[in-house]
């Protein structure tokens, strides 16, 4: 009867001993220490780390893994080659001695070997499926953490990146912030300064006031005198009239009546013999609608129409469309004239736009357009202007071709910001552009770097607030 | 379609303050002008003053300077007037008004805000 | 402020008549500011004529404007039932707004 054993020897090898009678077979066969288990579980979602020591370990056992399967295979084929040689042998020696119940024990054994041999063949194939697995994984993981590595590596320069501008940009605005203080200071001190001017004018007006006052109570008196001397010589001319048509009624039955003489433009006025420099009263093209105007009798020949005057901030500039529309201020000093009384005059026929410009160092310039107008309420006044000649700039500070005029509550400019709300003043603005000059009056010192002053770009620049300017149009065959 | 929709009917007592609404729908409550008129049983309208919402500037009648106070929210698209210090004369009937910065006419109306003001 | 005066404060008139309305300003007002409503009793006003001779829109053409300055007027062609109401004109020649005390046309 045939005894099978297996059995562990003390170096941890497979024994496998068959009993067979008298005579005893013993197989030593090598254990596989490095390869898993097919019970022990295979872990595939585990804790992924970016640290290069794990896949070194894997490299390295997946070597050692290499190296245990050429070993087996190696084995294997020996096993193979000494079953069949001690196969041969024994058959020799059964044949010999003609023993053929040990044939069928040998065969028998050969029999069990082979098919230990299959099992084992069966269990490497197994291993090297779960070798070739577990190969695979390694490499995914292998991938997504370099992925993931190049991901951060990529998040990190960003960021690096990202915190070195906003240093930059925090080292500028610090700068930014002290320069803002300190100019802050000086303004504050000129303040200080002009408020103490202030007080002195003050005194000095009030003082002023009071004799003027005095003044008043005489002229007053003087004025009562002078309406009745008035009103004795209005009746002594009446007599003389009345005296006069009794006389001359025989000779000359028609009445002279009144001429009321109205006056379109200065240039008008100016032609009709009026050449002193003034406020006159004009009237609006093929309308009864009069308007104040101030006339520059003198001024290149004279008869010019003031459109726009600037000069010391008197007047709030900061209006609606509807006063930029029908003019405000004062024609003796800071005002617009209107746009709609500008538009109808430029659509009658042809003028001039001169504008005159004054800086805080005493120097002066001009621009001269030789053809000027305006375009309807219709088409928001849009500024249409043709040969540009003059000392303030080479290049029009009015955009070519004109734009739409906005104000604070009619924003027409080109710009998705509100160029009137944000620089000041009605104007045709671009977007912004080269200039405006309805923009906040600055006084001395205190005039530049502004950016929403009396700007002429073309002739002093972005920051640069004008002292004084004069907007003036005149027929061109003046 | 334009609409300008006031808050209802209130009775205040003399001292108080209140605060009347006009919700403008239809239109782009910052492109025009909202403006505030009061008219006293059987007689005419007298302007209080104007908001215009794009830029929150108001003019107001002398007048009603103190008295009257207007703002708007652009988020709701809802004007204001507030009144203090009421008295018997602020009794009457409130009505806000758009225009346009171009047109300068008050082309919609609210159905008006009757006021009482009595102790 | 630049008052307006409305003449006369209260007319009557029969169906078919032409009535003519004034409002003269204290001081010059530009014809694009000057505007008249209509309001009938117990209701909101309603833009009649804008501009001094713009009919608002929804007005019957027997309304007209015309003026310039400091005169200005309203005329009915042909007065109708749905006239009987008080009008007002209103202007802007800077600061404040004003309207006229209203006239209020009766139908006899």
């Known amino acids: 009867y045939n005894n099978f054993r297996k059995s562990m020897d003390s170096i941890g090898k497979k024994q496998y001993q068959v009993q067979h009678g008298s005579c005893s077979y013993t197989f030593l066969l090598p254990e596989m220490d490095n390869c898993r288990s097919s019970s022990s579980p295979y872990v595939s979602n585990a804790v992924q780390r970016d640290a290069p020591l794990e896949y070194d370990d894997s490299v390295q056992r997946l070597q050692v893994l290499e190296n245990i399967m050429e070993n087996n295979t190696q084995w294997l084929m020996k096993l193979e080659n000494y079953i069949q040689d001690n196969m041969k042998k024994e058959m020799v020696e059964i044949q010999q001695n003609a023993v053929q119940n040990q044939t069928a024990v040998m065969i028998e054994i050969g029999t069990n070997l082979l098919n230990q041999t299959a099992e084992q063949t069966r269990k490497l194939t197994d291993v090297e499926a779960q070798v070739l697995n577990q190969t695979t994984r390694l490499e995914l993981q292998l991938l997504e953490h370099s992925l993931s590595t190049n991901k951060l590596e990529k998040q990190i320069l960003d960021q690096t990146s990202e915190i070195n501008k906003l240093q930059d940009k925090n080292s500028f605005l610090e700068k930014k912030v002290l320069a803002m203080e300190d100019k802050h200071i000086i303004q504050l001190q000129s303040i200080k300064e002009e408020k103490d001017q202030l007080q002195v004018l003050v005194s000095k007006q009030n003082s002023i006031i009071e004799e003027l006052e005095k003044k008043i109570v005489t002229a007053t008196v003087n004025n009562s005198v002078l309406q009745k001397q008035q009103h004795d010589l209005m009746e002594t001319v009446n007599n003389l009239l009345t005296m006069m048509s009794t006389s001359n009624s025989a000779k000359d039955p028609t009445v002279a009546k009144e001429e009321q003489i109205s006056f379109r433009d200065c240039a008008e006025v100016f032609k009709s013999g009026h050449t002193t420099n003034g406020i006159y009263t004009l009237t609006f093209p093929n309308s009864t609608e009069e308007i104040k105007a101030y006339c520059d009798m003198e001024a290149g020949g004279g008869g010019w129409t003031i459109i726009q005057r600037r000069e010391d901030g008197s007047v709030d500039f900061q209006r609606t469309w509807k006063e930029y529309k029908v003019g405000f201020g004062n024609p003796s000093g800071e005002y617009w004239l209107g746009n709609e009384f500008v538009s109808q005059l430029t659509n009658q026929q042809r003028y001039v736009l001169k504008i005159h410009l004054k800086d805080w160092e005493g120097n002066e310039a001009y621009s001269l357009y030789e053809h000027f107008y305006l375009s309807s309420e219709e088409l928001n006044y849009r500024i249409h202007l043709k040969g540009l000649t003059g000392t303030a700039g080479k290049i029009s500070s009015i955009s070519q071709p004109g734009n739409d005029f906005s104000t604070k509550d009619g924003d027409n400019d080109k710009c998705i910001c509100k160029c009137s709300q944000m620089l000041t003043g009605g104007w045709w603005f671009d977007a912004c552009g080269p200039s405006n000059l309805n923009g906040m009056y600055y006084p001395q010192r205190q005039n530049t770097n502004k950016f929403n002053g009396i700007k002429w770009y073309y002739w002093k620049g972005s920051g640069y607030s004008l002292k004084a300017t004069t907007m003036m149009i005149r027929p061109a065959d003046f | 379609q334009v609409q300008l929709q006031q808050s209802g009917a209130e009775l205040a007592r003399p001292g108080a303050s209140v605060k009347l609404s006009c919700k403008a729908s239809?239109?782009?409550?910052?492109?025009?002008?909202i403006n505030w008129a009061k008219q006293r049983t059987g007689q005419g309208l007298e302007w209080i003053g104007e908001?215009?919402?794009?830029?929150?500037?108001?003019y107001y009648n002398e007048k009603f300077k103190g008295k009257a106070t207007l703002t708007a929210d652009k988020s709701s698209s809802t004007a204001y007037m507030q009144l203090s210090s009421l008295t018997s004369e602020d009794s009457a009937v409130y009505f806000c008004?758009?225009?346009?910065?171009?047109?300068?006419?008050?082309?919609?109306w609210g159905q008006s805000t009757t006021l009482t003001v009595s102790s | 402020e630049n008052v307006l005066t409305q003449s006369p404060a209260i007319m009557a008139a029969s169906l078919g008549q032409k009535v003519t309305m004034t409002c003269s300003a204290s001081?010059?007002?530009?014809?694009?500011?000057l505007h008249w409503y209509q309001q009938k009793s117990g209701a909101s006003p309603k833009p009649l004529i804008h501009?001094?001779?713009n009919l608002a829109s929804g007005v019957p053409a027997r309304f007209s404007g015309s003026g310039s300055g400091t005169s200005y007027s309203l005329t009915i062609s042909s007065v109708e039932a749905e006239d009987d109401a008080t009008y007002y004109c209103?202007?802007?020649?800077?600061?404040?707004?004003?309207f006229g005390a209203g006239t209020k046309l009766e139908l006899k």
């Open positions: 908001i215009y919402p794009g830029s929150g500037d108001t």
């Open positions: 001081s010059s007002v530009s014809s694009s500011y």
């Open positions: 501009r001094t001779s």
């Open positions: 209103q202007q802007w020649s800077g600061y404040p707004f004003t």
């Open positions: 239809g239109y782009t409550f910052t492109d025009y002008y």
């Open positions: 008004a758009r225009y346009g910065y171009k047109g300068v006419y008050f082309d919609y």
